[in-house]
């Protein structure tokens, strides 16, 4: 799943079912957002690079009591090879930048969409 190198191939490769479900969940969150997501909770911004799934989980796991992102948290844990607990941080975090959960989710979704369009849209 961390190998996304195949996108330079002649045709696009659709994501695995698990990744497809993660994208769909992020879409649901961004489209169905009525009130401020997670009461406007702030999380550390991350570098959207190779280890982004773990980094995203490390950031989001610090948000508790927010049912809207619980499914996303569970899904991300399936993409991260190691156990992640609250307060844990990797070098992928931009430690001086905090953003709202809603923006974090939107950024993650945009990045995933960009990954799957690479190699097919010129």
């Amino acid at each position: 799943l961390t190998c996304l190198g195949g996108f330079a191939s002649p045709g696009p490769v659709p994501p695995s079912t698990a990744l497809r479900e993660l994208i769909e969940e992020l879409v649901n969150i961004t489209q169905n957002q009525k009130a401020p997501l997670c009461n406007g909770s702030m999380v550390w911004s991350i570098n959207l690079t190779a280890g982004m799934y773990c980094a995203a989980l490390e950031s989001l796991i610090n948000v508790s009591g927010c049912s809207a992102i619980e499914k996303t948290q569970r899904m991300l844990s399936g993409f991260c090879p190691h156990k992640v607990s609250a307060g844990q941080f990797s070098s992928l975090h931009v430690r001086d930048t905090k953003i709202e959960v809603a923006q974090f989710v939107k950024d993650l979704l945009l990045h995933l969409k960009k990954l799957f369009r690479e190699g097919q849209f010129n």
Epitope: P12, V13, P14, R20, K113, F116, R117
Partner: antibody
Framework: QVQLVQSGAEVKKPGASVKVSCKAS????????IHWVRQAPGQGLEWMGA????????AYNQKFKGRVTMTTDTSTSTAYMELRSLRSDDTAVYYC????????????WGQGTLVTVSS | EIVLTQSPATLSLSPGERATLSCRAS??????LHWYQQKPGQAPRLLIY???QSISGIPARFSGSGSGTDFTLTISSLEPEDFAVYYC?????????FGGGTKVEIK
Amino acid sequence: QVQLVQSGAEVKKPGASVKVSCKASGYTFIDYEIHWVRQAPGQGLEWMGAIDPETGGTAYNQKFKGRVTMTTDTSTSTAYMELRSLRSDDTAVYYCARILLYYYPMDYWGQGTLVTVSS
Amino acid sequence: EIVLTQSPATLSLSPGERATLSCRASQNISDYLHWYQQKPGQAPRLLIYYASQSISGIPARFSGSGSGTDFTLTISSLEPEDFAVYYCQNGHSFPLTFGGGTKVEIK
């Protein structure tokens, strides 16, 4: 509600160009790709290509490469499809449709634009 | 290019009967297969996505199944408004392709 409204019917001469517009409303335009599909009279559906409004990136069916150009104007949430060097077999209804990502289905379609190529 | 072959080309049935439409892909496309209904003078309408996922607002009599190369759209009991042309679509890889269509007509 989501709507894709296309420009009106066109009659063109062989060798000419046509530019069909598709105005989107009811959703965030840059969140979805716009795909173009055509249907010749009494025939099936044929995918022409797609554009990502966020980046302007395009993907064209090899069959139309060099003759088709897809563009968007994000300020008006409008997508355009221009087909050049028209031939009589380009006579068809041209549809725009939106897709979240290419592997998703085309969940909303425009009403179609009939382009007739005749001398 | 992934070629989708739909069969039969025409299906003649009566209201109340069960319709079974087939779509075969030239290579494995997992469940990246979508079904559309088209009536004369109208744009196609999405019925089923990812081979078997239903769409809200689409009657429950429409169902899809299959994975890999063989897919089926089933209409459990035909209503008068179901007589139309049905297309399958490859969502797996570019170029996106459609089957030739199956026309469901009144017997």
